[in-house]
């Protein structure tokens, strides 16, 4: 059986939309599937790599690599999106390409970044971990670390940094899929909102879905002990 909840929820474009949340009900009247997984149920994607989920994550990453920061022209906020999802009239899509990107580093002026920009994250304004020396962030935003400390400056002069961020990664469903969403939407969908991250590639949703002990490698499920837990 399914339990359907409908509610007006603030979405990425800054407007309230009617959203449906469909929850698979437990036939035996008990915990939801997500709770059962957290409690240690035999759920194969937590035990070993699931090809379907792996494909989903790779597809999400490929899309994210081509994303940019969509900044609303009325200064109401910004969100990481695909170009097609960013209004040409009401917003500015900040995406580095050709010669418009910053150099990889002050030591390498010739090599320009083509992957990015990312709303609220920039190698030029992140103090920790700093993009310098042997630790220059790669020209692939899906390989960027989470910035734990921004440079202490109110404004940077960069559109994608000085805007109010409206969405962050949200882990939704037992499949461990990730979307950049508002906190409100994420909570309504019973997802896990990652306040600390800017990109889906920085979070490991399946690790969150599975719970229990974190995977040794966040990309590789290894909870073989589930076979004995349940």
């Amino acid at each position: 059986a399914q339990h359907v909840t409908t509610q007006l929820v603030l979405r990425n474009k800054g407007v309230y939309e009617s959203v449906k949340y469909i929850q698979q009900e437990n036939f035996w009247i008990g915990p939801s599937s997500i709770d059962l997984i957290h409690l240690g149920a035999k759920f194969s994607p937590c035990i070993r790599k699931d090809q379907q989920i792996e494909q989903l994550v790779l597809r999400e990453r490929d899309l994210e690599r081509d994303s940019g920061c969509c900044v609303q022209n009325d200064h109401s906020g910004c969100i990481q999106t695909q170009r097609k999802d960013c209004s040409e009239t009401l917003a500015t899509f900040v995406k580095w390409q050709d010669d418009t990107g910053p150099p990889m580093d002050k030591s390498d002026l010739g090599q320009k970044r083509t992957s990015g920009a990312v709303c609220h994250q920039d190698p030029r304004t992140c103090e920790e971990p700093a993009s310098s020396g042997a630790h220059i962030w790669p020209d692939d935003i899906t390989k960027w670390p989470i910035c734990t400390e921004q440079a202490k400056s109110n404004r940077t002069g960069f559109l994608h940094m000085d805007c109010q961020i409206k969405g962050r990664p949200c882990c939704i469903s037992t499949k461990g899929s990730c979307e950049i969403t508002t906190r409100e939407y994420c909570e309504f969908m019973h997802g896990y909102f990652h306040e600390e991250a800017t990109l889906c590639s920085q979070v490991h949703c399946l690790d969150k879905v599975c719970g229990l002990l974190p995977f040794l490698n966040p990309e590789v499920p290894d909870q073989f002990y589930r076979l004995w837990l349940s």
């Epitope: 030591s107 002026l109 700093a130 310098s132």
Partner: antibody
């Protein structure tokens, strides 16, 4: 209010080492992203970039002069220094230090300059 | 190294006149930076990233260009604009400046 001021010996003889100091206020060279550059201008000639130093102690030099240049800083005293070894008359110029900014820029720029110090190399 | 060639070397303009000067690079660069220098003074940043006005710079100044060809335009010349204008590149080391365009008041 950002301000920079250069100081130097005024006059020195060929083969000596020129030591320049840039004292600044309104920013700190220990702040992430900050940098200071040295640029000189010979009488009636254009501007010539010499060297940059950054908050993380990264240093970049003009290769044409690299063997003679040494840039350094004392962030606690808000000072940057430039030494030019084995000077000759061609090094006679006005020497400027400038803060490196990048507000809103994909690269960087010299956004605030000192007043300059005139150096004459003469025997 | 990247060589920047400014032209003309010297020019004059009457108040209210439109002024355009150019800076060409011997190889492709990403952005151009422009500085104004008056006699006895230090250079002042006018334009960064080819077309962005630095803080406090009057809107009569504008910059444009791409690749190897860039220009600085003053829409209506004013007496206080008489100065030498230098272009600069930050696309590769060594950082280089143009020799300057001296703008005189007619």
């Amino acid at each position: 209010q950002v301000a920079l001021k250069e100081s130097g010996p005024g006059i020195l003889q060929p083969s000596q080492t020129l030591s320049l100091t840039c004292s600044f206020s309104g920013f700190s060279l220990s702040t992430f992203g900050m940098g200071v550059g040295w640029i000189r201008q010979s009488s009636g000639k254009g501007l010539e970039w010499l060297a940059n130093i950054w908050w993380d102690d990264d240093k970049y030099y003009n290769p044409a002069l690299k063997s003679r240049l040494t840039i350094s800083k004392d962030a606690s005293k808000n000072q940057a220094f430039l030494k030019i070894a084995n000077v000759d008359t061609a090094d006679t110029a006005t020497y400027y230090c400038a803060r490196i900014g990048n507000y809103g820029s994909n690269y960087w720029y010299f956004d605030v300059w000192g007043t300059g110090t005139t150096v004459t190399v003469s025997s | 190294q990247i060589v920047l060639t400014q032209s003309p070397a010297i020019m004059s303009a009457s108040p209210g006149e439109r002024v355009t000067m150019t800076c060409s690079a011997n190889s492709r660069i990403s952005y151009m930076y422009w500085y104004q220098q008056k006699p006895g003074s230090s250079p002042r940043l006018l334009i960064y990233d080819t077309s962005n006005l630095a803080s406090g710079v009057p809107v009569r100044f504008s910059g444009s260009g791409s690749g190897t060809s860039y220009s600085l335009t003053i829409s209506r010349m004013e007496a206080e604009d008489a100065a030498t204008y230098n272009c600069q590149q930050w696309s590769s080391y060594p950082l280089t400046f143009g020799a300057g365009t001296k703008l005189e008041l007619k």
